[in-house]
Amino acid sequence: QRGPLPKPSLQALPSSLVPLEKPVTLRCQGPPGVDLYRLEKLSSSRYQDQAVLFIPAMKRHLAGRYRCSYQNGSLWSPPSDQLELVATGVFAKPSLSAQPGPAVSSGGDVTLQCQTRYGFDQFALYKEGDPAPYKNPERWYRASFPIITVTAAHSGTYRCYSFSSGDPYLWSAPSDPLELMVTGTSVTPSRLPTEPPSSVAEFSEATAELTVSFTNKVFTTETSRSITTSPKESDSPAGPARQYYTK
């Protein structure tokens, strides 16, 4: 064996956001000819010595962080990046609204607001087709996601989730979808990016608001929060490669 073993990848199919009672498969992928795989749930004593974990029906206790590694001969690989498996539908859905409204002129501003009756301090906003959510810590039962200088790329279907930082892997059901329509522009398909844009967020300490824009690169903000990305899942309808904020 020459050189260190490469770390494996760990993905959740079809998604790492799993509604309660729905199936999900965690798959660890290393190089060909692996002798043994080990897939473990962090912060628990649960592990299994195989590459695939099949969950026929998602349960609360299965939510959490997973990672895997493999053995070749007497050598163990470095662990995979952690995969966060989230159970959704644990709590009632929040409501998602657009201010001033869901129809926006190109170049204008719009704020998406996710609101819940419960005391959740975390919110995640998803745009259909994007690989990652925009998460927003907020203390007042509501999260604001301003989108400044709207472009045609912001058109689409949005949903939000609410959850608690005390139980970060147990999420609400998704809000009803909100269709954001950007008027006054026409974009030809050839000018659209070939991949869904990555999300970039700037966090405002003063207002605890997340400003969301779109770019083809992911970079960290200048504040003490950083964006980390788990490996992108490929092929089949894989779940989002989730991006999140850590102090």
């Epitope: 079809p14 998604s15 009672e21 199936p23 498969t25 195989q50 099949f54 026929p56």
Partner: antibody, heavy 119, light 107 residues
Framework: VTLKESGPGILQPSQTLSLTCSFS??????????VGWIRQPSGKGLEWLAH???????YYNTALKSRLTISKDTSNNQVFLKIASVDTADTATYYC????????????WGQGTTLTVSS | DIQMTQSPASLSASVGETVTITCRAS??????LAWYQQKQGKSPHLLVY???NLADGVPSRFSGSGSGTQFSLKINSLQPEDFGSYYC?????????FGGGTKLEIK
């Protein structure tokens, strides 16, 4: 892989139906393997009833849940289904089938056993 | 519960023709869908699993497509042995439900 269903053939209303699925060519102790029961009234469509996984997790048709019990005998390669207090609406052909998690499908089926509920 | 709506309910076609049967799920089921063929007096037989994958021994004239909520089974160049009933079934959380079936008859 083969599966074969057996049952009483005829029952009277309010009796309990006991079905047995005997299989070979696979083991229900193998990770990701399950066995399910499906029924089909004559000339009608298919209806999933229940299934059981290698780890003894059991799932039931919501509408029939209170009347159904599925169990397994791994060492003898058998799965059982009981349906309490049968009625004429339970007259059907009953099939058992193997489930493999990878394909999420019923990949092998038995030949079926016919039940007639009549007074 | 997830409803599976299959169409058409019946279909007449001639040997050599191409036919398509569709199945619509009432919510997103990703690729958790299988197609079965059933001939008169026989048990169902798996054709396609995970929406697009042909089961072992199934002729290549059969193909499955779709994901999410819209699925289809296509049979190219129909053969005499292809006539019978076809069912779709979802596996995305219980209860697993079947479509109502499509009866494919010889014209």
């Amino acid at each position: 892989v083969t599966l074969k269903e057996s049952g009483p053939g005829i029952l009277q209303p309010s009796q309990t139906l006991s079905l047995t699925c005997s299989f070979s060519g696979f083991s229900l102790s193998t990770y990701g393997i399950g066995v399910g029961w499906i029924r089909q009234p004559s000339g009608k469509g298919l209806e999933w009833l229940a299934h059981i996984w290698w780890d003894d997790n059991k799932y039931y048709n919501t509408a029939l849940k209170s009347r159904l019990t599925i169990s397994k005998d791994t060492s003898n390669n058998q799965v059982f289904l009981k349906i309490a207090s049968v009625d004429t609406a339970d007259t059907a052909t009953y099939y058992c089938a193997r489930i493999h998690y990878y394909g999420s499908s019923l990949d092998y089926w038995g030949q079926g056993t016919t039940l007639t509920v009549s007074s | 519960d997830i409803q599976m709506t299959q169409s058409p309910a019946s279909l007449s076609a001639s040997v050599g023709e191409t036919v398509t049967i569709t199945c619509r799920a009432s919510e997103n089921i990703y690729s958790y869908l299988a197609w079965y063929q059933q001939k008169q007096g026989k048990s169902p037989h798996l054709l396609v699993y995970a929406a697009t994958n042909l089961a072992d021994g199934v002729p290549s004239r059969f193909s499955g497509s779709g994901s999410g909520t819209q699925f289809s089974l296509k049979i190219n160049s129909l053969q005499p042995e292809d006539f019978g009933s076809y069912y779709c079934q979802h596996f995305y959380g219980t209860p697993w439900t079947f479509g109502g079936g499509t009866k494919l008859e010889i014209k």
